[in-house]
């Protein structure tokens, strides 16, 4: 095999961004080609880039890693055996045919997306230890370029499951944001509030356009990123609209699972007298970093009528308080642990009290209705690798708890 | 091919207890949520049980509540319902069902597995 | 819980005609309705989703409409084999509720 590290490539002009974790010339064919058409390539976070050559700073297409399934070696149509140059990238709703150069050149392509789709380092290919080291650092770039861009009160969790963790555990906050619920390359926020006496839940979407997150509004307010779509809901709601933060002790405070012997159902205990510890949630919403000239907000609008809403939901969830809900028996997932703020005192929660309220629904003056998403093939999406490893040391050790 | 298959159905007394498996394949359990629905005989659908799994959450129907557990094996890619202090009424098919993007309908189900719960 | 109210419970039709099943939630469920065929010994299976989207590979005589409380399944052209049960099923909430079906016949 041979043993360049990199394949030839003339060197860009200085100042170009972004700078790309891996690029070579690549042959793709979309479901809609017909033949192979030879771009440069370059991958940057969960995007490849195509440029008509490796001169240009303009990509002329990009590709979202983001609904990412599988990769594939190919054998060419023709072919009685595997050149080692062709492979396909299977996405959620469509698939992708490259051609390379060299074994070496598709293995390293191979290596890089699962890198940044599973943040990960892949075992499983024809590499040599400098390869691996390169995609180690490129990991290590992804990790912090999500920490960068991927606030604590964003949750890989569907839309349901985002209304369960805002019920059950109120005291942590009452905004999250979650993957978009239609599978594009947006998010939606799920917030729940107090109105007239009945908690409601509302999903609203962002748009991701260009470089801009495009919360989807009465007037659609831009904003540069995640960081300042949840600042614009803050300051919105007169800071009413708290950002949803599960710290990462949380489960030492509030108690372990037992499973109960007469039935095996998981019970929640919570210690008797808990100690000087972690409070169960990070008190308040996280500072957020400053926004920059392009999300400053405009002048807050008077402190809200309960009844006025200032945004226009996709469509709201149940009005469905939190008391009398099963108690969820693991632990819930954080993409990031939250910047540590100072913890006040432990603290339970309080207890459920009184019935459960009849559900109502709110529908004051809601402006236009955006369309619930769409019911699609659900897939591993990109980035849960992160989250689904801290979530399984996190299981492990209740497990451990409860036996 | 997404593929859900059903077993642990048969056969039990009143107040018994029977474990249900659903083995998933063509897809994995990261993110959105699976539930079991059942069917009595010549009845319509009543849904038992849901598990979210980012989360872990779970949410069970008034009629199971306290006797089902619905918990769900990752690396196995297999769901469950454990089903305690069983009665007459819980005779019915037994379906798990995935749930479709971001919980909007469930797009792929089981064929199904009978619990007859008979003295 | 949000109850679903169906109806008709059952409904003789003949191959060809234009057939409309209505669904009525307790309370606004937006556009969370899904609509669901059954046949006898089968799994359900997904038709119509959000109310109106059409599930991947369900023929277009299918169709949903509604939103808020009243929702409606149309199939605009029986076929042989449309005849089944159909199920109306709110995902708004997630203490997830069926109707309790419409039996569809052949006239």
């Known amino acids: 095999m041979a043993s360049a590290l990199r394949p030839p490539r003339v060197p860009k002009p200085k100042g170009v961004l972004p700078s790309h974790y891996y690029e070579s010339f690549l042959e793709k064919k979309g479901p809609c080609d017909r033949d192979y058409k030879k771009f440069w390539a370059g991958l940057q976070g969960l995007t490849i880039y195509f440029y008509n050559s490796n001169r240009d700073f303009q990509h002329v297409e990009k590709l979202n890693l983001g609904a990412f399934e599988k990769l594939t070696d190919e054998i060419p149509w023709g072919s009685s055996r595997d050149p080692g140059t062709h492979f396909s990238l299977i996405l959620r709703d469509q698939e992708i045919k490259f051609k390379v150069e060299t074994l070496e050149c598709r293995e390293m392509w191979k290596g890089f997306i699962l890198t940044v789709v599973e943040l990960r380092v892949p075992t499983d290919l024809t590499l040599l230890p400098g390869h691996l080291y390169m995609m180690s650092e490129v990991l290590a770039k992804e990790e912090a370029r999500r920490a960068l861009e991927t606030p604590s009160c964003f949750l890989k969790v569907s839309r349901l499951e985002a209304q369960l963790l805002l019920e059950r555990y109120p005291e942590c906050g009452n905004l999250l944001l979650r993957p978009s619920g239609d599978g594009a390359d947006g998010v939606s926020v799920t917030t729940r509030q107090m109105h007239n006496g009945t908690h409601v839940v509302r999903h609203y979407k962002v748009k991701r356009e260009g470089p801009k997150y495009v919360i989807d509004v009465e007037q659609p307010f831009s904003c540069t990123s995640l960081d300042a779509v949840v600042n614009y809901f803050v300051s919105h709601t007169k800071k009413a609209l708290v950002p949803f933060l599960l710290d990462e002790d949380y489960e030492k405070v509030l108690g372990y699972v037992e499973a109960d012997k007469e039935n095996g159902e998981n019970v929640w205990v919570a210690p008797s007298a808990p100690g000087p510890g972690p409070a169960p949630c990070t008190g308040g919403p996280k500072p957020l970093s400053p926004a920059s000239s392009q999300d400053k907000l405009p002048p807050l609008p008077p402190l809200p009528n309960q009844e006025e809403n200032y945004v226009t939901p996709i469509g709201d969830g149940p009005a469905v308080d939190y008391e009398n809900q099963d108690v969820a028996s693991s632990s819930w997932p954080v993409i990031l642990k939250p910047k540590k703020l100072p913890k006040p005192p432990a603290k339970l929660p309080k207890p459920p009290v009184g019935p459960k309220p009849e559900p109502k629904v709110f529908n004051g003056g809601l402006g236009r209705k955006l369309p619930v998403s769409s019911a699609q093939p659900l897939f591993p999406t990109a980035g849960l690798a992160d989250m689904t490893a801290e979530l399984q040391k996190k299981l492990e050790k209740r497990r451990a708890l409860e036996h | 091919e997404v593929q859900l298959l059903e077993s642990g159905g048969g056969l039990v007394q009143p107040g018994g207890s029977l474990r249900l498996s659903c083995a998933a394949s063509?897809?994995?359990?990261?993110?959105?949520?699976m539930s079991w629905v059942r069917q009595a005989p010549g009845k319509g659908l009543e849904w038992v049980s849901s598990?979210?799994?980012?989360?872990?959450?779970?949410s069970y129907a008034d009629s199971v509540k306290g006797r089902f557990t619905i918990s769900r094996d990752n690396s196995k890619n297999t769901l469950y319902l454990q089903m305690n202090s069983l009665r007459a009424e819980d005779t019915a098919v037994y379906y798990c069902?995935?749930?479709?993007?971001?919980?909007?309908?469930?797009?792929?189900w089981g064929q199904g597995t009978l619990v007859t719960v008979s003295s | 819980d949000i109850q679903m109210t169906q109806s008709p419970s059952s409904l003789s039709a003949s191959v060809g005609d234009r057939v409309t099943i209505t669904c009525r939630a307790s309370?606004?469920?937006?556009?969370?309705l899904n609509w669901y065929q059954q046949k006898p010994g089968k799994a359900p299976k997904l038709l119509i989703y959000a109310a109106s989207s059409l599930q991947s590979g369900v023929p277009s005589r299918f169709s949903g409409s509604g939103s808020g409380t009243d929702f409606t399944l149309t199939i605009s052209s029986l076929q042989p084999e449309d005849f089944a049960t159909y199920y109306c099923?709110?995902?708004?909430?997630?203490?997830?509720?069926f109707g309790q079906g419409t039996k569809l016949e052949i006239k």
């Open positions: 309370q606004s469920i937006s556009s969370y």
């Open positions: 598990i979210y799994y980012s989360s872990g959450s779970t």
């Open positions: 069902a995935r749930h479709g993007w971001d919980d909007n309908g469930f797009d792929y």
């Open positions: 063509g897809f994995t359990f990261y993110y959105g949520g």
């Open positions: 099923q709110q995902v708004y909430s997630y203490l997830f509720t």
